[in-house]
């Protein structure tokens, strides 16, 4: 349905509050270094213009596309070239190239300070001007996460508001707020990683890959839904994410609301778990649907072999309609296996396709493809045994040392990667242990490998910006489903020339003593990565000894009266003994 004025259409559909929030998020994701006040000014101007168009759709410029209107607005920023350099060149281009240009300049790792909770100041700001306070939150998250799922960020802003509403009147604001904000931050990071994987999948593997991923995941969640129903939701959901990944946040939010409405209207034929979601207001409803637990499997699901291994007509069906046939296989296999990860299901479907390609060219295809299901066994066993091995290690050593083991492992695989990136990825992978290893057996594999996919995508995104390893580029770009096995297969990089030893890399000062625990850990883990870069062939025992000595040294000096003197005196001794231990 075409509208005379696209901006009026979206303003009317979304309402002023959501319209303003989404425009603020979109602008903050494009111009990540601009001050909040500058964005507020731009958003207010756009909103006033939208109101004018809503009142009269044939008013001047109201017929222009959103990309044209928003791009023109962004290009009015006076300091564009000074602040962003070549991003300013985008403004020389015409749509749609101009928007594509803006997208390529989004920075996944902007140089922005960590946000520290300051309960007293924040409560004062919240009470003085709640709208400005929440706008600032949208801005701060959006500029740090330029691919954050726009409508979902509006939901998180409501959670943020609820936290301050509850905690600001409390006697101990700090005790009330800190755990809530920490938990929200974890949810934000997870949500950001999920959407970044979707956007990366569009960028690197195309729409078909995103659809295949969604067919597998939604078939797991909605095993009672028929294939046509799953396909409809997948098609609509793919459009929603494509729009958000392209910066079209208003269309994305509007289409997401339509999809939530459709799902709730058809919940009887989709899932019994949707009832609680569908009674909620829009933002909560959409969030709830996205996070809904997997429905119970229908009791009467027949075995798959009859239709996909024993049927004499398989090659005919495959030849007639490859996409439909393989889509059906992926749907049927996935709905029966909530205990598998999405990438495992995609690897199984890929193996099935390869088998049919081979068998359907042979003299007796049915004899050839009859045993196809046997080929899935090693595909399933490999990640299962990996999860068991890693969870055993996690349970034995705890999160911090599990992170250290992963930092060592990944530094050996890719010692050219920057230390901050290796530490970030290792820490994230380590947290997967805490999240997934405590779950029942049937949930460990999907939890682990699905979260691993998010962490490895972060590595791929950061590596794409500054490529340093051909092996990583290959794992990141060859196949979405094979990423994790590809990284698992990487060994010590034999071609790597060890980094020369620099004492200052391992020099600590008294400032470490006052750091929060996680930042203390990061300092020590950075030293660990540097040790591996210096001695890639060091054994686990050697590294464990040296890291233990470092921890003891930090604890000892932080307990002293004259901390800095202790660091200055004991530090060089530690560095020397560490070199000896690693020789």
């Amino acid at each position: 349905d075409t509208h005379k004025s696209e901006i009026a259409h979206r303003f009317n559909d979304l309402g002023e509050k959501h319209f303003k929030g989404l425009v603020l998020v979109a602008f903050s994701q494009y111009l990540q270094q601009c001050p909040f006040e500058d964005h507020v000014k731009l958003v207010n101007e756009v909103t006033e213009f939208a109101k004018k168009c809503a009142a009269d759709e044939s008013a001047e410029n109201c017929d222009k596309s959103l990309h044209t209107l928003f791009g023109d607005k962004l290009c009015t920023v006076a300091t564009l070239r000074a602040t962003y350099g070549e991003l300013a060149d985008c403004c020389e281009k015409q749509e749609p190239e101009r928007n594509e240009c803006f997208l390529t300049h989004k920075d996944d790792h902007p140089n922005l300070p960590k946000l520290k909770p300051e309960p007293d100041a924040q409560c004062a700001a919240f009470q003085e001007d709640p709208d400005k306070f929440l706008g600032k939150y949208l801005y701060e998250v959006a500029r740090r996460h330029p691919y954050f799922y726009g409508p979902e960020l509006l939901f998180h802003a409501e959670e943020y508001k609820a936290d301050f509403t509850e905690c600001c009147p409390a006697d101990d604001k700090l005790a009330c707020l800190i755990p809530k904000l920490d938990a929200l931050k974890e949810r934000i990071l997870l949500s950001s990683a999920k959407e970044r994987l979707k956007c990366s999948s569009f960028q690197n593997f195309g729409e078909r890959a995103v659809k295949a991923w969604s067919v597998a995941r939604l078939s797991q969640k909605f095993p009672k839904a028929d294939f046509a129903e799953v396909s409809k939701i997948v098609t609509d959901l793919t459009k929603v994410h494509k729009e958000c990944c392209h910066g079209d946040l208003l269309e994305c939010a509007d289409d997401r609301a339509d999809l939530a409405k459709y799902i709730c209207e058809h919940q009887d034929s989709i899932s019994g778990k949707l009832k609680a979601c569908c009674d909620k207001p829009l933002l909560q409803k959409s969030h709830c649907i996205a996070e809904v637990k997997e429905d119970d499997l229908p009791s009467d699901l027949p075995a798959l072999a009859a239709d996909f291994a024993e049927d004499k007509e398989i090659c005919k069906h495959y030849k007639d309609a490859k996409d439909v046939f393989l889509g059906t296989f992926l749907y049927e296999y996935s709905r029966r296996h909530p205990d598998y990860s999405v990438s495992l299901l995609l690897r199984i479907a890929k193996t099935y396709e390869a088998t049919l390609e081979k068998c359907c060219a042979e003299a007796d295809p049915p004899a050839c493809y009859r045993t196809v299901f046997d080929q899935f066994t090693p595909l399933v066993e490999e990640p299962k045994s990996l999860v068991k091995k890693n969870c055993d290690l996690f349970e034995e050593v705890g999160e911090y040392d599990f992170q250290n083991a992963l930092i060592v492992r990944y530094t050996k695989k890719a010692p050219q990667v920057s230390t901050p990136t290796l530490v970030e990825i290792g820490r994230t992978l380590g947290k997967v242990g805490s999240r997934c290893c405590k779950l029942p057996e049937s949930e460990r594999l999907p939890c682990s490998e699905n979260h691993l996919a998010l962490a490895l995508n972060r590595l791929c995104v950061l590596h794409e910006k500054t490529p340093v390893s051909e092996k990583i580029t290959k794992c990141c770009t060859d196949s979405l489903a094979e990423r994790r096995p590809c990284f698992s297969a990487l060994e010590l990089d034999e071609g790597y020339v060890p980094k020369e030893f620099k004492a200052e890399t391992f020099t600590f000062h008294a400032d470490i003593c006052t750091l929060p625990e996680d930042e203390k850990q990061i300092k020590k883990q950075s030293a660990l990565a540097e040790l591996v870069k210096h001695k890639p062939k060091a054994t686990k025992e050697q590294l464990k000894t040296v890291l233990g000595n470092f921890s003891a040294f930090v604890a000892k000096c932080c307990g002293r009266e004259d901390k800095e003197a202790c660091f200055a005196e004991e530090g060089p001794k530690l560095v020397a003994s560490s070199q000896l231990a690693l020789a």
């Epitope: 046509a228 129903e229 409809k232 239709d307 309609a321 059906t328």
Partner: nanobody
């Protein structure tokens, strides 16, 4: 019991268009798919496409994708197959069929419970 009545078909030049229709009567239930199949002389029945009665989602065979389009008119309990850019190899008897959407093997004739009588489509070069 569902009865399926077909109309349309006939003779057309290569590159031309035809529209087939299939009207359902009787106890028609939701979660139903309507499939189109065709059978050329001496060949097996071949999947053409399928449309979901509930949500209008369509799937097509590789040989007709981009040329044929299915649609539905819920009030009239009718589905249509619009065939454009016809080729001589599209010549066949075209059948519509109704089945339960839950079986998911929409490409397989054996999964459909009710069939129309068929209508001849001939594409001359």
């Amino acid at each position: 019991q569902v009865q399926l009545q077909q109309s349309g078909g006939g003779l057309v030049q290569a590159g031309g268009s035809l529209r087939l229709s299939c009207a359902a009567s009787g106890r028609f239930f939701s979660r139903q798919v309507m499939g189109w199949f065709r059978q050329a002389p001496g060949k097996d029945r071949e999947f053409v496409g399928v449309i979901s009665w509930d949500n209008g989602v369509t799937f097509y065979s590789d040989s007709v994708k981009g040329r044929f389009t299915m649609s539905r008119e819920i009030a009239k309990k009718t589905v249509h197959l619009q065939m454009n850019s016809l080729k001589p190899e599209d010549t066949a008897v075209y059948y519509c069929a109704a089945g339960n959407a839950l079986h998911s093997r929409y490409y397989s004739p054996s999964k459909y419970d009710y069939w129309g009588p068929g209508t001849q489509v001939t594409v001359s070069s």
